[in-house]
Each structure stands twice: as structure tokens, then as C-alpha cells.
């Protein structure tokens, strides 16, 4: 036969009642026993697991004058806003002397209007751009039968006959309000209100049309932008930085961009004082009224080289017999690209003009045809770069070596 | 007075499935967790999992996870353990317990047990 | 997991002679809640079910002899029987209730 010892008889003589009700509510349960001697501490269990937390009060109250007579002993547990962890199956728990007891069992169920798990949030999509949008409630009591609502219209002929939790929307071409109904036996609760606003799709295909040293010009496709014209689009451009390096679509430039705002149509802009010969990056973004799209992905340019912008500086030029000492520095003015040498112009009175290649060099010593009696030598000289030779200097007169 | 029954043994082949039970009488059913324990012939006895009656709630050993499913049916009063690809190590004899909540008094099935051979 | 370990695993005693056995559990098995400590000790005969013998570490079940003793805390505990019976023949486990259930190996004692 099973073993085990009988069971005394128990000391409960009242026990937890039933609690059912919507969330929020608050209530008590309530064991009673009736023991002889020192009152036993009550402990309540929730589905077998004693509840570590519990909001109860214990009274215990004396049958008689003596210690070892009756007492009567009350717990009480109390459940401040009802929630689903809160529902299953409670009873109190006494040790007394050598035995362990239980109650009989009182149930807490939760029963009311559903509760919304998760509610549409809020955001921006591109337009005709498809998305989707999430709903979860529960009750109980189940089932519950969602219906989506778009700008107030239901998008289905009853609750539980469309989408339920995941609402694919296939895209907007206007700001439009979507929100869901839960329904169970109990009634219907509405979530929030998610507003969808509706912004230009991100613009395609920027591109070069023109360079110049110190400005591009760009072009590029709009994106559609729903039932909202486009206002203007905005073209950032930012040096680039070898050491930043700027990756296609990184979300920021390495440093405060260049900003310039373009009238639409038409979808061009120039953009002037830029450095000559410099790699940039740029990207546009163009707004509605709604707000902006976002921005394309950072496209790498680069100005061309111009030519010098000034002439060698300090040059200066004696002569001595049939040679002449020329020499010059560096022009102050942007050199508008990588300089790769000087030329040389002389010229007499009444003698044909010689050029010269000098290289990077900024010293050049000439020697004069004849014994150099030619009169009224002027010699100019011009920087270049891969795009052309800068202005030439003024004429400078060859003057007579004067030793010392 | 509290019993909990048990078959005294079940023979099964190799790779078949068995459910074994343990009726409950004398107590209220729901109110206390049923323990499953496993001793192999000359071998130790390990905890294989329990069950709550009244939500089904169980908790599982580890090592018998994959290998028994505790069930109850709260209308008979009885509490079931359930094997799957048996193997000559189910061999066995396994008993059902009552939890008291680490207290007394204590209650145990007499055992069934279980024979896995072809 | 907790994780129960039992010492020695067999010993052999005269009638009469006092015994002890350890059993050592990996974390505290004392809930703050009950102020009980969840340790069982079982005494199972050859072809019988476990007999529970000590529960609360130290509370004797009715209806056990006296010579049965726990004792111990936090994670250290002891069985002792004060005068060992022939009728004492059996394998010892102990049993951690405080979170699931574990035993102990058990330890086998035997009569000389």
C-alpha cells in the first residue's frame, strides 16, 4: 500500500475566495484557521510557488485567557491593480508543528475590455513606399478580433476578417492617421492614433554637369513626394578628408558641410566658392511641406585644376656682358593646382620674343645673342599648372651687373 | 486518506512510446505539485520533473527534457509521464510524488516499473 | 542548478555504534520567507519505496525512532543515528527542495 502518514485533520476553516475582474481593480483574499496554541505565521501560495512579495496582514485573535487555548487567525492578501501575472490559483500555507497545510483554493481571473500590447507608433515613410504597422491586445476574455482604421474608415467589413497584428500597408501618397480596434465579448478598446507622415522620396541619380575650378554644377532626379509639391531641395557639400573618409551613406560628414538651398524645378544648382582642384563630397535632400527626405548617399566630386592667379613675385634680372641673371619667387596669389614650372619671355627693342620652359626652377641664367649690345632687354615670367599658364608678369628691364 | 496509485510494471520494446499513471485520491488534486522521480535497478534516485495540476504548469531535469512529457487530467485525478524512443537505459522503476512544500507530511506512489527490452 | 553531494558513499558499523553522514549542498538551501531550510533526509530498504525520515534539516517525521538525527545549516548537514539497528540496512539520500528537487548520490550502510 502507498505510505504516508494520515493527514490531521485541517485548520482552515475559511478560505480564498474567487476574484474576477478587469485590470486595475483591486481586491483581497482572505483564509481563515482556527488553531490551538501559538499562532502559526500564514504564507499564501499563488500556483504552488509561494509568493515571496506578498501584500498581506495577518490578525490573530485569542478564543480564550490562556496561551494554549484557540486562536482564530486571519490572513488577508491583498491586490492592488489587477494584471494578468496576477490571475491562477491561490491558497495559504501553514506549518503546523510536524505538518504542512494548504487551503482549498480560490481563483483570480481577469476579465474586462482588451488590453493593448503594442499600438501603432508614429513615423515618416517615403512616399508610396511600402511599410507596416504592428498591433497586439489581449484579453481576457479571447478571442480578441482586431480591425485597423485608416484616417477613421475601417479597412475591413468586420473585426477578425482583416490583417490582425501586422498591417502591411503598400504606400501613401498622403499624411493619413491609422489606428486599430481590439474587440472581445466584453466591448472594444481603441489604441492610439499613429500618425504616418508622408515625406519626398530620397532623390536619385545626383550627378555632375559642369566643373569649374571654383564651382560645380549638379543635377539630379526628385523622388515623388505624394499629393505635396516639393518647396526646394537642399545640396550639402563637404571637403573630403582622407583621414575621415567619408563611406557611402555614413549618416554625418566629418565636418560642418557647405549648405546651399536650390529653387524647384529645375533640379540643378551651382555651387561657387569652392577650392580649386579639391576633392568634395556631396549629397542633396529635397522637402514638402511635410518635411524632408532623406539624404543620398555622399557622392565624390572634385574641382579641376585652374591656372595660377597671379604672376611670380620679386622677379629680378641683371645683366652682365652676353648673360643675364634671372630670377623670381613663388606668386603669392592660389596657384589653383599642383604648379608645374615657371615660362620665360625676353624680348630687345627690336628682336623677335624668346620663350622659355624653365621647370620648377626659380633661377634661369640666359645667353644674350651677339656681345649683348641688344638694347631695352625686358624679361616677364608666368607660373603654370595643368590647366594653363597663370598671367604673366610686368615686363622687368635687364639691368647692367654693377659689382659690389 | 492521501494515495497515489501506480501500475506495478509495464513492459515495452525498444523505440516505442509509454505513458505511465499515478491516480490521486484523498487530497484536492489541483493544490499540490506531483513529482516524478527515476531509479534505475542498484542506482540512485533522480528528480525527472513536476507538474501543477490545477495550470499544467511543469519544470523539467535537464537531462529528461527531451525524453518525458507530464501531463495531467484534472477529471480523473491523475497525473501521467510520458517516454518516448525507449531505450534499455529507461529501464526503470519510476515514482510519482507529492510535493508538501518541503514539509510533511510526505506522499509516494509505490512505483511503477518499467522494462524496455525487445 | 543546485547540487547535492553525499560522503561516504558506503560504511559498514556493528550494532549499536553510532553513525554519521554528510551531505553538502552547492548554494544555501535556507528560504528567507519560511525561515525553513529545505533539506529532506530518505531512508530507502531494498525493494521498498523511500521512506521519509527528517525533513526542515532537522524535524523528525512522526512515527520515525529517535535515534535519527539532522542537524546542520546554510550548506553543510548531517544525519546521525545514535544506535544503529539491524533494521537500519538501507541507502541514505538526502534531498533539496528548496528550488525543484535534487538528491545526494545516497550512501549505503551495512551491517558488520
Known amino acids: 500500500a502507498p505510505r504516508g502518514t494520515q493527514a490531521e485533520e485541517s485548520p482552515f476553516v475559511g478560505n480564498p475566495g474567487n476574484i474576477t475582474g478587469a485590470r486595475g481593480l483591486t481586491g483581497t483574499l482572505r483564509c481563515q484557521l482556527q488553531v490551538q496554541g501559538e499562532p502559526p505565521e500564514v504564507h499564501w501560495l499563488r500556483d504552488g510557488q509561494i509568493l515571496e512579495l506578498a501584500d498581506s496582514t495577518q490578525t490573530q485573535v485569542p478564543l480564550g485567557e490562556d496561551e494554549q487555548d484557540d486562536w482564530i487567525v486571519v490572513s488577508q492578501l491583498r491586490i492592488t491593480s489587477l494584471q494578468l501575472s496576477d490571475t491562477g490559483q491561490y491558497q495559504c500555507l501553514v506549518f503546523l508543528g510536524h505538518q504542512t497545510f494548504v487551503s482549498q483554493p480560490g481563483y483570480v481571473g481577469l476579465e474586462g475590455l482588451p488590453y493593448f500590447l503594442e499600438e501603432p507608433e508614429d513615423r515618416t515613410v517615403a512616399a508610396n513606399t511600402p511599410f507596416n504597422l504592428s498591433c497586439q491586445a489581449q484579453g481576457p476574455p479571447e478571442p480578441v478580433d482586431l480591425l485597423w482604421l485608416q484616417d477613421a474608415v475601417p479597412l475591413a467589413t468586420a473585426p477578425g476578417h482583416g490583417p490582425q497584428r501586422s498591417l502591411h500597408v503598400p504606400g501613401l501618397n498622403k499624411t493619413s492617421s491609422f489606428s486599430c480596434e481590439a474587440h472581445n465579448a466584453k466591448g472594444v478598446t481603441t489604441s492610439r492614433t499613429a500618425t504616418i507622415t508622408v515625406l519626398p522620396q530620397q532623390p536619385r541619380n545626383l550627378h555632375l554637369v559642369s566643373r569649374q575650378p571654383t564651382e560645380l554644377e549638379v543635377a539630379w532626379t526628385p523622388g515623388l513626394s505624394g499629393i505635396y509639391p516639393l518647396t526646394h531641395c537642399t545640396l550639402q557639400a563637404v571637403l573630403s578628408d582622407d583621414g575621415m573618409g567619408i563611406q557611402a551613406g555614413e549618416p554625418d560628414p566629418p565636418e560642418e558641410p557647405l549648405t546651399s538651398q536650390a529653387s524647384v524645378p529645375p533640379h540643378q544648382l551651382r555651387l561657387g566658392s569652392l577650392h580649386p582642384h579639391t576633392p568634395y563630397h556631396i549629397r542633396v535632400a529635397c522637402t514638402s511641406s511635410q518635411g524632408p527626405s532623406s539624404w543620398t548617399h555622399w557622392l565624390p566630386v572634385e574641382t579641376p585644376e585652374g591656372v595660377p592667379l597671379g604672376p611670380p613675385e620679386n622677379i629680378s634680372a641683371t645683366r652682365n656682358g652676353s648673360q643675364a641673371f634671372v630670377h623670381w619667387q613663388e606668386p603669392r596669389a592660389p596657384l589653383q593646382g599642383t604648379l608645374l614650372g615657371y615660362r620665360l619671355a625676353y624680348q630687345g627693342q627690336d628682336t623677335p620674343e624668346v620663350l622659355m620652359d624653365i621647370g620648377l626652377r626659380q633661377e634661369v641664367t640666359l645667353e644674350l645673342q651677339g656681345d649683348g649690345s641688344v638694347s631695352n632687354l625686358t624679361v616677364c615670367v608666368a607660373a603654370y599648372t595643368a590647366a594653363g599658364d597663370g598671367p604673366w608678369s610686368l615686363p622687368v628691364p635687364l639691368e647692367a651687373w654693377r659689382p659690389g | 486518506q492521501v494515495q497515489l496509485q501506480q501500475p506495478g510494471a509495464e513492459l515495452v520494446k525498444p523505440g516505442a512510446s509509454v505513458k505511465l499513471s499515478c491516480k490521486a485520491s484523498?487530497?484536492?488534486?489541483?493544490?499540490?505539485?506531483i513529482n516524478w522521480v527515476k531509479q534505475r535497478p542498484g542506482q540512485g534516485l533522480e528528480w525527472i520533473g513536476n507538474i501543477y495540476p490545477d495550470s499544467s504548469s511543469t519544470n523539467y531535469n535537464e537531462k529528461f527534457k527531451s525524453k518525458a512529457t507530464l501531463t495531467v487530467d484534472k477529471s480523473s485525478t491523475t497525473a501521467y509521464i510520458q517516454f518516448s524512443s525507449l531505450t534499455s537505459e529507461d529501464s526503470a522503476v519510476y515514482y510519482c510524488?507529492?510535493?508538501?512544500?518541503?514539509?510533511?507530511?510526505?506522499?509516494w506512489g509505490q512505483g511503477t516499473t518499467l522494462t524496455v527490452s525487445s | 542548478d543546485i547540487v547535492m553531494s553525499q560522503s561516504p558513499s558506503s560504511l559498514a558499523v556493528s550494532a549499536g555504534e553510532k553513525v554519521t553522514m554528510s551531505c553538502k549542498s552547492s548554494?544555501?538551501?535556507?528560504?528567507?520567507?519560511?525561515?525553513?531550510?529545505?533539506l529532506a533526509w530518505y531512508q530507502q530498504k531494498p525493494g521498498q519505496s523511500p521512506k521519509l525520515l527528517i525533513y526542515w534539516a532537522s524535524t523528525r517525521q512522526s512515527g520515525v525512532p529517535d535515534r535519527f538525527t539532522g542537524s546542520g545549516s546554510g550548506t553543510d548537514f548531517t544525519l546521525t543515528i545514535s544506535s544503529v539497528q539491524a533494521e537500519d540496512l538501507a541507502v541514505y539520500y538526502c534531498?533539496?527542495?528548496?528550488?525543484?528537487?535534487?538528491f545526494g548520490g545516497g550512501t549505503k550502510l551495512e551491517i558488520k
Open positions: 484523498g487530497y484536492t488534486f489541483t493544490s499540490y505539485w
Open positions: 548554494q544555501s538551501l535556507l528560504n528567507s520567507r519560511t525561515r525553513k531550510i529545505y
Open positions: 534531498k533539496q527542495s528548496y528550488n525543484l528537487w535534487t
Open positions: 510524488t507529492r510535493d508538501t512544500y518541503g514539509g510533511s507530511p510526505d506522499y
